[in-house]
């Protein structure tokens, strides 16, 4: 089932609302304002910690700061997954975990963060300068990856602060398309507000020629941009940068399930809200995200994406249709 945001026909104002602004002028700014406020770039943070007790033991914690539904998390070392990195663990929010030596225990900490304990000796043992990367596949944002490693001078028992240094493996059609739409929406909102300041709102007359209500000239996604939201996307492979120490999180013991940013208004509603994504064998984790978007049309997650075009008066509604099962 293909789910696309529909632009509802706006009803004419009730006859009794003399002098009041038309629905178009009332509804549209709020809709666009909602878009602007909720529009935030997703972020992935990574925290790497060497355990004081065992020098070959590491704990990696990763979290996703975004409004979409996480469908898969891949943790790798030695660089980004699909760019020379080796998969350590794959975590699915409904179906469980697959992990590979030297991973000892991968687990979900919260709906948007995971932890992985690594233990090793000899060749499989992680060393202090190893880079660890976490990739979150989510709907509708696409795939976001960040990498981190211990600072060279860090003492055992200390951790690198969570580093939200995302590598842009952006869904070109999805993320850039949605961003463009939101930018356009925000500009249009400003334009509307300015126009509203300069002249009084005209009364909308019900259409005599058509029984339907007049459709406001609100932004509606073009067929091209609607299609773009469903296109399997190209992954930009970039080199993995070690974690930087500038971080949005406090240095002294960060809350690593992450204090949510204000833009993350729509959180996944629970485990059932997460979409299912095909998972290739460990050696071929090249573009998990393509599967995510290829399925997006047929198998929408229970919760709608963070992009709410027209708020339902009953609140954010789950998209219809159960999670697909093959």
């Amino acid at each position: 089932m293909r789910t696309e945001a529909q632009v509802p026909a706006l009803q004419p104002p009730e006859p009794g609302l003399e002098g009041a602004m038309g629905h178009r002028t009332l509804v549209l700014p709020w809709v666009l304002l909602t878009l602007c406020v909720t529009a935030g770039t997703p972020e992935v943070w990574v925290q790497v910690r060497m355990e004081a007790t065992e020098l070959s033991s590491f704990t990696i914690r990763c979290g996703f700061l975004g409004s979409g539904s996480i469908s898969l998390v891949t943790v790798s070392w030695g660089g980004p997954n699909g760019a020379g990195g080796t998969t350590l663990a794959v975590l699915h929010p409904e179906r469980g975990i697959r992990q590979w030596a030297p991973a000892r225990q991968a687990r979900w900490e919260t709906q948007s963060s995971i932890s992985l304990i690594l233990e090793g000796s000899g060749a499989s043992s992680p060393c202090a300068n190893t880079t660890f990367c976490c990739k979150f596949a989510s709907f509708p944002e696409g795939s976001w990856e960040a990498c981190g490693s211990l600072p060279p001078s860090s003492d055992p028992g200390l951790s690198a602060p969570p580093t939200p240094a995302p590598i842009l493996r952006a869904d070109l059609a999805g993320i850039l398309g949605v961003s463009g739409v939101l930018l356009f929406g925000c500009v249009y909102l400003l334009h509307l507000l300015r126009r509203h300041k300069h002249r009084p709102a005209p009364r909308l007359q019900p259409s005599r020629t058509s029984p339907q209500a007049p459709r406001a000239r609100a932004w509606a996604p073009s067929q091209a941009s609607q299609a773009a939201l469903h296109v399997p996307y190209a992954t930009i492979n970039t080199s993995c940068r070690p974690a930087t120490l500038d971080t949005a999180h406090p240095h002294g013991g960060p809350s690593w399930w992450a204090s949510l940013p204000t833009h993350a208004a729509h959180r996944p509603q629970g485990p059932a809200a997460w979409a299912s994504t095909p998972i290739p064998a460990r050696g071929s984790f090249v573009s998990v995200e393509n599967g995510l978007y290829a399925q997006a049309g047929e198998r929408p997650p229970h919760t709608g994406p963070g992009l709410t075009l027209f708020p339902d008066p009953r609140g954010p509604r789950a998209m219809e249709g159960p999670l697909g099962v093959r």
């Epitope: 080796t86 998969t87 699915h92 929010p93 409904e94 179906r95 469980g96 975990i97 697959r98 992990q99 590979w100 030596a101 225990q105 991968a106 687990r107 485990p271 095909p278 998972i279 290739p280 064998a281 460990r282 050696g283 071929s284 099962v325 093959r326």
Partner: antibody, heavy 119, light 107 residues
Framework: EVQLQQSGPELVKPGSSVKISCEAS????????VDWVKQSHGKSLEWIGA????????SYNQKFEGKATLTVDKSSTTVYMELRSLTSEDSAVYYC????????????WGTGTTVTVSS | DIVMTQSQKFMSTSVGDRVSITCKAS??????VDWYQQKPGQSPKTLIH???SRHTGVPDRFTGSGSGTDFTLTISNIQSEDLADYFC?????????FGGGTKLEVK
């Protein structure tokens, strides 16, 4: 037809080692992980570990670390499990099973190999 | 480790009946539970994966349900060939663990 053909029964002495095999056919070998499961006589099943045929990456149940070693030979599309320092507790039927990465489950099971440890 | 408890070790039923085999996880395992059937002297066969998805070729008499900690395999219109052991498996966390099994006896 997808098949996992396991090697025949083994009768071994305590303290020795045994290497059993699981030959895959009917599918692209590298696309699926292979897991191993132990079934002691009259008992339930125990997950031993998994191997990824692509790179030989392994994952073990801690209980079987040091007991079982998983290896792969891509040229013969065969996965091996070596069991060492055998005791009577290791007498069991051992199964290999194909793990579906897309759907997260075992869809095909091997024929099973009976290992008997006896002096 | 997560413990998967199949409280009924044996269940007796008649042809045409309906039976529900239960499996309880010691902690929340979402829908990461599969059901396997093992007939005497044979390898296990896959029935249900992801708690409720029927494996290819499995008759629709077999139905899986549940999520979190409580899972059920329901067999309706039981046939004599359903005489077997039934195991649940969780793969939510490592190590993966199986239930103790339920032996279905058909009168």
């Amino acid at each position: 037809e997808v098949q996992l053909q396991q090697s025949g029964p083994e009768l071994v002495k305590p303290g020795s080692s045994v290497k059993i095999s699981c030959e895959a056919s009917g599918y692209t070998f590298a696309d699926y992980n292979v897991d191993w499961v132990k079934q002691s006589h009259g008992k339930s099943l125990e997950w031993i570990g998994a191997i990824n045929p692509n790179d030989g990456g392994t994952s073990y149940n801690q209980k079987f670390e040091g007991k079982a070693t998983l290896t792969v030979d891509k040229s013969s599309t065969t996965v091996y499990m070596e069991l060492r320092s055998l005791t009577s507790e290791d007498s069991a039927v051992y199964y290999c099973a194909r793990w579906v990465n897309n759907d997260w489950y075992f869809d095909v099971w091997g024929t099973g190999t009976t290992v008997t440890v006896s002096s | 480790d997560i413990v998967m408890t199949q409280s009924q070790k044996f269940m007796s039923t008649s042809v045409g009946d309906r039976v529900s085999i239960t499996c309880k996880a010691s902690q929340n395992v979402r829908s990461a539970v599969d059901w396997y059937q093992q007939k005497p002297g044979q390898s296990p066969k896959t029935l249900i994966h992801s708690a409720s998805s029927r494996h290819t070729g499995v008759p629709d008499r077999f139905t899986g349900s549940g999520s979190g900690t409580d899972f059920t395999l329901t067999i309706s219109n039981i046939q004599s060939e359903d005489l077997a052991d039934y195991f649940c498996l969780q793969h939510w966390n490592y190590p993966y663990t199986f239930g103790g099994g339920t032996k279905l006896e058909v009168k």
